[in-house]
């Protein structure tokens, strides 16, 4: 309807005596600005006067003046859209209808608003969700249809009269749509909250109680159970009886079924509130609980740990680790099922008690070979002593021990012999699989751990072997002590230091580099003739006749060795000179005659000189003097002289006779 003024405000406002009321309001006039405003209480239209009768709570005139008695009621609006009102304080007799008489230049309107003022503060209203389940978060809402700027209030939550520690969120609304104060509390109820009273309390600014609303919580929850056991500590011995009772302390809704569980698994045919266990065995040890269900779900009691005590069972030994390497650490663990746990242990090694070891574990920081063997143990608790189990085997691995190289040959060993050596050891784990020898050679290994040296050399001094499994152990080297004939025999001139001259004192030494055995004999030989048996051969005054090829021999018990032939050279001046004539000492004139100067000299003659019967030197210097043609005048005695680096020598006279030829005789 276009002829209506448009107003927006809450339909009814609520308050109580002494509080205040705030009326949010908006409007839109049909034309122009508001010129007059009157607030009536319970207005009634008078047809006679065509005006409204009633108590005037507020009146604004064209000049804008407000009577002083109207301070309780305030128009907070304006001339075109805001019509908000405030009444402070508000009284019980303010209840009823408020009429807003609005006049513009040409139009008039009466807008009605209901006001409900109670004698005392009215209670807030608690709103709960349709169903509350334990541990599921819910929001509790407390709503009060009141809010006024001039009258602050607070809403507080209580559980069984005690303020709730959860933080509530309070909100207010003062709008044309709604006026309220609301408190929201997020809360996770537990089963124990079932049946408890929740209160929302309205308080003034000073915390003074004004009013409240209460509700009883209906918390749906699974059955809450208590388990009781006889005996109370749930510790029994094999053969004893045990009784467990399940009590329902709370269930909402009522429970429907009962069952018992052991270690999480349901026990068959156990559907009553009492569980009787007769003549229990150790297998019945475990965690027991009862389970009762309702429409919400199953509820379980706390677990009762039933301990059936028994003497230790046969024990087993765990070894960390076998096989073990010598020097590594090893730990033995004695394992035996027992309740209570064993307090004492007895350990055995190869059946013999290991004194002083009473712990569950035995630790060896540095294992030795003799720790190998079978380990077993016995566990003991208050109920008795267990039996010894089968035991565990400790294998200790180590390199071969006490390795030795042994010569199999009869002693002594001679150069050229075939030598057999064996590599022996005392013990080894794992078994020896191969052998090594030092030094390396092209030798034969006829079988594992045996070395054959064919034609052993004089210089094969030491041999060492190693026996190897996962590791190699070397023996100390063994000396072959090979015996051999003297080696590198040679003749050495000791004196003179320079060349040997006839008449010198001469010493020759018979040297050798080595001999085994060391005891030796010497022999000197020249042209197959034995000269001496000393290491030295001495000449007091050497003569050219001593020159020649010398050898020395050195022998020991193994054999003898000769030196290479050594040539002794004696230097001497030309000697035994003589003049030989060819074809003879009588030559016919006209023929050829050759005179030769023969000599014995070392070094050979390097220079010849010829002399005649008058000791006159001839102009010839070679070994041969050739006369061709020979003349009778050449007849006479000749001699020669030979010279070398040592000295000179001269021959005796030799006579050449030259006779006349037949022709010469014929001419005479």
């Amino acid at each position: 309807d276009s002829s209506k003024w448009v107003f927006e405000h809450p339909e009814t406002l609520y308050a109580w005596e002494g509080a205040c009321v705030w009326i949010p309001c908006t409007y839109r006039a049909l034309d122009g600005d508001l010129e007059s405003f009157i607030l009536f209480h319970n207005p009634e239209y008078n047809k006679n006067t065509s005006k409204f009768d009633g108590t005037r709570l507020y009146e604004s005139t064209k000049d804008g003046k407000v009577p002083s008695e109207q301070k309780r009621v305030q128009f907070l609006g304006d001339k075109n859209k805001n019509c908000t009102l405030s009444i402070h304080p508000v009284h019980l007799n303010d209840s009823g209808q408020l009429g807003l008489r609005m006049e513009s230049k040409t139009e008039k309107w009466m807008e009605r608003i209901h006001l409900n003022v109670s004698e005392r503060p009215f209670p807030p209203h608690i709103q709960l969700p349709p169903e509350i389940q334990e541990s599921q978060e819910v929001t509790l809402t407390c709503l009060l249809n009141f809010s006024c700027y001039g009258y602050p209030i607070q809403l507080q939550w209580l559980l069984e009269g005690v303020p709730m520690r959860q933080a509530a969120v309070t909100s207010t609304s003062l709008t044309i749509k709604s006026v309220f104060t609301r408190s929201e509390l997020k809360f996770s109820p537990q089963w124990s909250h079932h049946g408890k009273i929740v209160t929302c309390q309205l308080q003034d600014a000073d915390g003074k109680f004004l009013s409240n609303d209460t509700v009883q919580l209906n918390v749906k929850h699974t059955p809450k159970l208590e388990i009781k056991v006889t005996p109370s500590d749930a510790i029994v011995r094999e053969g004893d009886s045990v009784t467990m009772t399940c009590e329902v302390s709370s269930s909402n809704p009522e429970y429907t079924t009962v069952s018992w569980l052991k270690d999480g698994t349901s026990l068959k045919k156990q559907n009553t509130f009492t569980l009787n266990l007769r003549e229990v065995t150790k297998d019945q040890s475990g965690k027991y609980c009862c389970q009762v269900s309702n429409d919400v779900g199953p509820g379980r009691s706390e677990e009762v740990f039933l301990q059936v005590q028994y003497a230790p069972e046969p024990s087993t030994v765990q070894i960390l680790h076998s096989p073990a390497v010598e020097g590594s650490q090893v730990e033995f663990l004695c394992m035996s099922l027992a309740n209570p746990l064993p307090t004492n242990y007895t350990w055995y090694h190869n059946g013999k008690e290991m004194q002083g070891r009473t712990e569950e574990k035995v630790h060896i920081p540095k294992i030795l070979p003799w720790h190998a063997g079978t380990y077993s143990c016995v566990a003991e608790n208050i109920l008795g002593t267990g039996q010894r189990g089968p035991g565990a085997e400790l294998d200790v691995q180590y390199p071969p021990k006490k390795v030795t190289t042994v010569i199999q040959n009869p002693m002594p060993i001679r150069e050229g012999d075939t030598v057999t050596l064996s590599c022996n050891y005392n013990s080894s784990n794992p078994s020896v699989t191969r052998y090594e020898w030092k030094p390396h050679g092209a030798w034969e290994e006829p079988s594992l751990g045996v070395l054959k040296i064919q034609n052993v050399g004089w210089d094969n001094t030491t041999i060492a072997c190693a026996a190897c499994n996962s590791w190699c152990s070397w023996a100390s080297p063994v000396a072959l002590n090979v015996q051999y004939a003297p080696r590198d025999v040679r003749v050495r001139k000791i004196k003179p230091l320079s060349e040997i001259h006839s008449g010198n004192s001469v010493s020759l030494q018979c040297d050798f580099s080595s001999s085994h055995p060391k005891e030796v004999q010497f022999f000197w030989e020249k042209n197959g003739r034995l000269l001496g048996k000393e290491s030295q051969l001495n000449f007091d005054s050497i003569s050219p006749e001593d020159a020649g090829s010398y050898s020395c021999w050195v022998n020991n018990s193994i054999g003898q060795t000769a030196s290479k032939a050594w040539t002794l050279e004696v230097l001497y001046a030309p000697r035994r000179l003589r003049v030989s004539m060819s074809p003879g000492d009588q030559v016919m004139e006209g023929k050829s005659a050759t005179l030769t100067c023969e000599s014995d000299a070392n070094p050979p003659v390097s220079h010849y000189t010829w002399f005649d019967w008058n000791n006159q030197s001839l102009p010839y210097h070679s070994q041969k003097l050739r006369l061709e043609p020979v003349k009778v005048q050449h007849s006479g005695a000749y001699w020669c002289q030979g010279t070398n680096s040592v000295g000179k020598g001269r021959s005796p006279l030799s006579t050449l006779t030259v006779y006349y030829s037949p022709e010469t005789i014929g001419r005479r």
């Epitope: 650490q329 090694h349 013999k352 004194q355 002083g356 070891r357 060896i364 030795l368 003799w370 720790h371």
Partner: nanobody, 125 residues
């Protein structure tokens, strides 16, 4: 026979610590089982702790968790670390040695041949 010389004894308050040393005249590692023994006035000598060449140890029940036996092969020295000492630990402490002739023959109840002169330990409350 080997000579053994103990040191490190003394007086200490209850709850305190001491470290005893025993120097051997010969190289003992690998061939000897070594031990600590004690004798309180008017009481019999009792085994305290032993150690063998494999490093395996044994202890008297009264000292387990408080005392630690160890050796230093390079120094040829045996040690006894004593923590949380009690008045009942007061005694003359002796170092001893025996041949290591079987793998598990080294324990506090074994017979020991060679003995040191001892070192006094006094724990007051």
């Amino acid at each position: 026979q080997i000579q053994l010389v103990e040191s490190g004894g003394g007086s200490v308050q209850s709850g305190g610590s001491l470290r005893l040393s025993c120097k051997a005249s010969v190289y003992t590692w690998g061939t000897y089982c070594m031990g600590w023994f004690r004798q309180a006035p008017g009481k019999e000598r009792e085994g305290v702790a032993t150690i063998d060449p494999a490093g395996t140890t044994t202890y008297a029940n009264s000292v387990k968790g408080r005392f630690t036996i160890s050796d230093d092969n390079a120094q040829n020295t045996l040690y006894l670390q004593m923590n949380s000492l009690r008045p009942e630990d007061t005694a003359m402490y002796y170092c001893a040695a025996r041949a290591y002739d079987a793998p598990w023959a080294c324990w506090t109840g074994a017979v020991f041949r060679d003995w040191g002169q001892g070192t006094q330990v006094t724990v007051s409350s």
